[in-house]
């Protein structure tokens, strides 16, 4: 069957894709096209009620800082 | 510290198959986590597969079906048996893992390169 993602598990999955960038456990606000009165998403619905691929579990990783210029 | 040995890594022609293998050694005790990732030539270093300490496994879209990741968490070791390959795998295949007891620290292998020609 579908393989899941659920709990420690899932940390550290969203641990080791993110990395340093550190990671949400629901998407940011307006993030995507959702509309104000769809419910918001969070990883445990989509990789833990249901299996999820690896491009899903990178949607929740947090943006990448700007390299600081001098 | 941890250190990562990939091998069998080559060259194949299309719709061959190859078995690659990552051993890790040194500080091993928490290894949660698990990956191959892949870079080709002037692209930027893609995720292909993860498994986690109890064998959940994750895949690239662009993988999924051809390629199978293993672990045998006795021999720290990580597989990652790729079939159906295709030109556009081409690729320095990297391991990595992630150290729990560090705060998430990744360790990178330094690569195997796989060749698939048509």
């Known amino acids: 069957g579908p393989e899941t993602l659920c709990g420690a598990e899932l940390v550290d999955a969203l641990q080791f894709v993110c990395g340093d960038r550190g990671f949400y456990f629901n998407k940011p606000t307006g993030y995507g096209s959702s509309s104000r009165r769809a419910p918001q998403t969070g990883i445990v619905d989509e990789c833990c009620f249901r299996s999820c691929d690896l491009r899903r579990l990178e949607m929740y990783c947090a943006p990448l800082k700007p390299a600081k210029s001098a | 510290q941890v250190q990562l040995q990939e091998s069998g890594g080559g060259l194949v022609q299309a719709g061959g198959s190859l078995r690659l293998s990552c051993a890790a050694s040194?500080?091993?005790?928490?290894?949660?986590?698990m990956g191959w990732y892949r870079q080709a030539p002037g692209k930027e270093r893609e995720l292909v597969a993860t498994?986690?300490?109890?064998?959940?496994?994750n895949y690239a879209d662009s993988v999924k079906g051809r390629f199978t990741i293993s672990r045998d968490n006795a021999k720290n070791t990580v597989y990652l048996q790729m079939n159906s390959l295709k030109p556009e795998d081409t690729a320095v295949y990297y391991c990595a893992v992630v150290h729990r007891s560090t705060g998430g620290y990744k360790y990178w292998g330094q690569g195997t390169q796989v060749t698939v020609s048509s």
């Open positions: 498994i986690s300490i109890g064998s959940t496994t």
């Open positions: 040194g500080n091993i005790f928490d290894l949660p986590y």
